[in-house]
Amino acid sequence: LVPHLGDREKRDSVCPQGKYIHPQNNSICCTKCHKGTYLYNDCPGPGQDTDCRECESGSFTASENHLRHCLSCSKCRKEMGQVEISSCTVDRDTVCGCRKNQYRHYWSENLFQCFNCSLCLNGTVHLSCQEKQNTVCTCHAGFFLRENECVSCSNCKKSLECTKLCLPQIENVKGTEDSGTT
């Protein structure tokens, strides 16, 4: 199957790499603008220069292009705990990340929140905390994993998934409940 090409891709494919077809004259191929710049005016004719201008502060282009405007720099989302790893330059967008001992959780493709890495109290670290994944904990006997924390089996109710891990404790809890004590 031939992939469906958009109008811009169709126009670009007529010209050699690094050039694009003039929007008003499809017999002219203009040189694309370098990253960090944008298209101010198309080249007037074959072999003539494209008029490219540098992106203004707060904007960027990360690859060669024939965009009429630079792209706005991203802002790190403080409300999601994000911090700026590197600031925006004319040829690179802002890079956002998390603080030390935190990981990123992506709620969607373009939205992440920073959370503290689990310390595995009452357990051991099975896998260390990574940039995009929390620590994986293994809990000690008498504890079960809930929301990535090791919780005492005394907090395990019969209806919960922890019953298999906490079977002896559940029997004890059941016994105290039956006898009417708390």
Epitope: R77, E79, M80, H105, Q113, F115, N116, N134, E147
Partner: nanobody, 119 residues
């Protein structure tokens, strides 16, 4: 005790509008970032929008950008979601929630309000 109560859902035709409200109590509303999430039939939770404590910072999922508007009235402890140009794919149960703090789950969210977009 944290309480979040959504209202304003209902049946609406494609292209129509609805305004959801979320009445909050049991915590200092004016200090908290608030979130709207939704769950379509047979799907997982989708982050729709959020708004910071002061109402100055907002976020919208690509699927609702330009159609939905999140706002809040801190004097009334109420969160809103104005939904315009509704589409069939917006059909879902909409929940308001407190921004998670401890991990990627919602400790506090409402019981939800159903929005059905159908002709």
């Amino acid at each position: 005790e944290v309480q979040l109560l959504e209202s304003g859902g209902g049946l609406v035709q494609p292209g129509g509008s609805l305004r959801l409200s979320c009445a909050a109590s049991g915590f200092t509303f004016e200090n908290k970032t608030m979130v709207w999430v939704r769950q379509a039939p047979g799907k997982g939770l989708e982050w729709v929008s959020h708004i910071d404590a002061t109402g100055t910072i907002t976020y919208y999922a690509d699927s609702v950008e330009g159609r939905f508007t999140i706002s809040r009235d801190n004097s009334k402890n109420t969160l809103y979601l104005q939904m315009n140009s509704l589409r069939a794919e917006d059909t879902a149960v909409y929940y308001c929630a407190l921004l998670p703090k401890r991990g990627p789950w919602f400790d506090y969210r409402g019981q939800g309000t159903l929005v059905t977009v159908s002709s």
